[in-house]
């Protein structure tokens, strides 16, 4: 048989080979597509099916208009002036190129050493759905999970039956390298068809600014609560991009989840101890904090904590 | 079918600015990337960048950087590229490609001559 | 930067005849993920502007004539014209695009006997 393949919306016609040029009742066309049930069969004295094929007084089959539920398998017999039967046979396959793919929220600045997110690749009204591909500087960008992670997305309209992709990439770029030209390429995988591309980005890669010191607050001032009372400790840091922040006390990190505010509600004697905060970055490694002494006293004398503690508010610990 | 018209020969001072232009037809201008190559006699072809009209980004060589401006007008299909403050060594003949992102400059500009001479 | 050096920088043959010539590059140009060479032949005819013959190594540009191939991997790539027509007097160059710069070859001047 013969593999075609027809763009959706156009006109197909599948000649019937070995057809006599008056067609009598030695020829019919059999269908097996997502319109027939099982094979339908069309023959030249027969009504035109649904306006969707009928045979040419040549005895080739016209589609006027191919749709997604043409595809399938046709079938021609006729027998030719010597009473010979000949046979054609084809696969029809259809396709619809869509609309330019587009990189939609692009990023403008991405930070070296940390995960971003570049931007999401949308194609819209393809089929089959076909696939989106990634590039770097021109040459593809292969997804590794650490480095290049790139989610993808496919869905189907429920009435057209066209795909719209959606892929996302995120990178974790290099420090010290050249401005990278990133763009998404939408292809189709027919053979002599070029991938459609979108329009290139060009982000600025950023370095991610050291830490300029850590510091602990502390409230109440000094560290010294009654029982029952509530010690809040806030981890401060300028970093770009914002660190990591774990707790640690009398030496144990705590299991909790990252967060720069530490609240201990309701404090009792078992929440003593000291505490500090460590910040982790992706490129300067961790750095913790001065600790502080947390005391629960019953009668509320003012013990001072370790470091230095402001007047009135909260205690401020700096590197 | 696809071309691009160059602009005519330019005979300028040292020190000045040149800008020649490249006019594309045959195709959507803003779907392909427009490369700028030079060639002097005897010193083979070099790269000096790209633009991509359909957003105007830029990608120089680093060795034409502050030497070559790229530009795009949409609206008349058009790319440019200024030369400042242009000595003996940036007389030369000056190529606009265009290139369908990784297949290479597959049509290219008839070429401007620039001179520079006091 | 990628170095590329081709060799003959001239060579004269007679029309019919067999022509090779060489295009080597200070890296490789052979991109893993995809198999590809991001290498390009172009042709320059006298006083004219260049004409993309092949690109990634070894693929014709719609409408060369077949008598032109490219072949060739990694660092060491090769243009063939296997039976020279008097029309191909020209400079041929080869032009690494797998890295910025893009840098091209010095060339090669094909003269007919």
């Known amino acids: 048989g013969q593999n075609i393949t027809a763009r959706i919306g156009e006109p197909l016609m599948l000649s019937c080979k070995g057809a006599p040029k008056k067609p009598t009742q030695k020829l019919e066309w059999k269908l097996n597509t997502g319109r027939t049930e099982a094979w339908k069969v069309l023959s030249p004295q027969g009504d035109p099916w649904d306006s969707v094929a009928r045979i040419l007084p040549n005895g080739s089959l016209l589609l006027p208009a191919i749709g997604i539920v043409d595809e399938g398998t046709f079938r021609c017999r006729a027998t030719n002036r010597l009473g010979k039967e000949v046979k054609s046979n084809y696969r029809v396959r259809v396709y619809q190129i869509p609309g330019k793919p587009e990189i939609v929220n692009p990023a403008s600045e991405l930070t070296a050493n940390v995960p971003n997110k570049v931007g999401t690749c949308v194609s819209e009204g393809s089929y089959p759905a076909g696939t989106l591909s990634w590039h770097l500087d021109g040459k593809p960008l292969i997804p590794d999970g650490k480095g290049t992670v790139v989610k993808e997305e496919t869905r189907r309209h429920p009435e057209t039956g066209l795909f719209t992709l959606r892929s996302e990439l995120t990178v974790t770029p290099a420090q010290g390298g050249t401005t990278p030209t990133y763009s998404c390429s939408f292809s189709l995988g027919l053979p002599r068809r070029r991938p459609l591309n979108t329009a290139p980005i060009q982000p600025r890669v950023r370095e991610p600014l050291p830490p300029e010191g850590i510091q602990l607050l502390v409230e109440p001032e000094g560290g010294t609560v009654a029982p029952g009372g509530t010690v809040t400790l806030t981890c401060a840091i300028s970093a770009q991009p914002p660190p990591q922040i774990h707790w640690i006390k009398d030496g144990t990190p705590l299991p909790l989840a990252p967060s720069p505010v530490l609240l201990l509600p309701e404090v009792g004697h078992e929440d003593e101890g000291i505490y500090s905060c460590v910040a982790t970055h992706p490129s300067h490694g961790p750095q913790e904090s001065p600790p502080v002494n947390i005391r629960v006293t019953e009668t509320g004398d003012e013990g001072q904590a370790a470091g230095s503690v402001d007047g009135s508010g909260l205690g401020t610990l700096a590197l | 079918q696809v071309q691009l018209q160059q602009s005519g020969p330019e005979l300028v001072k040292p020190g000045a600015s040149v800008r020649i232009s490249c006019k594309a037809s045959?195709?959507?201008?803003?779907?392909?990337?427009i490369h700028w190559v030079k060639q002097r006699p005897g010193q083979g072809l070099e790269w000096i960048g790209w633009?991509?009209?359909?957003?105007?980004?830029?990608k120089y060589n680093e060795k034409f950087k502050g030497k070559a401006t790229l530009t795009a007008d949409k609206s008349s299909s058009t790319a440019y590229m200024q030369l400042s403050s242009l000595t003996s060594e940036d007389s030369a003949v000056y190529f606009c490609?265009?290139?369908?992102?990784?297949?290479?400059?597959?049509?290219w500009g008839q070429g401007t001559s620039v001179t520079v001479s006091s | 930067d990628i170095v590329m050096s081709q060799s003959p920088s001239s060579l004269a043959v007679s029309v019919g005849e067999k022509v090779t010539m060489s295009c080597k590059s200070s890296?490789?140009?052979?991109?893993?993920?995809?198999?590809?060479?991001?290498l390009a032949w172009y042709q320059q005819k006298p006083g004219q502007s260049l004409k993309l013959l092949i690109y990634?190594?070894?693929t014709r540009e719609s409408g060369v004539p077949d008598r032109f191939a490219g072949s060739g991997s990694g660092t060491d790539f090769t243009l063939t014209i296997s039976s020279v027509k008097a029309e191909d007097l020209a400079v041929y160059y080869c032009?690494?695009?797998?890295?910025?710069?893009?840098?091209f070859g010095g060339g090669t001047k094909l003269e007919i006997k």
């Open positions: 490609a265009r290139y369908d992102y990784d297949y290479a400059m597959d049509y």
């Open positions: 032009q690494q695009y797998f890295g910025y710069p893009y840098t």
């Open positions: 990634w190594a070894s």
């Open positions: 045959g195709y959507t201008f803003t779907d392909y990337y």
């Open positions: 633009i991509y009209p359909g957003n105007v980004i830029t």
């Open positions: 890296q490789t140009l052979l991109y893993s993920s995809n198999q590809k060479n991001y």
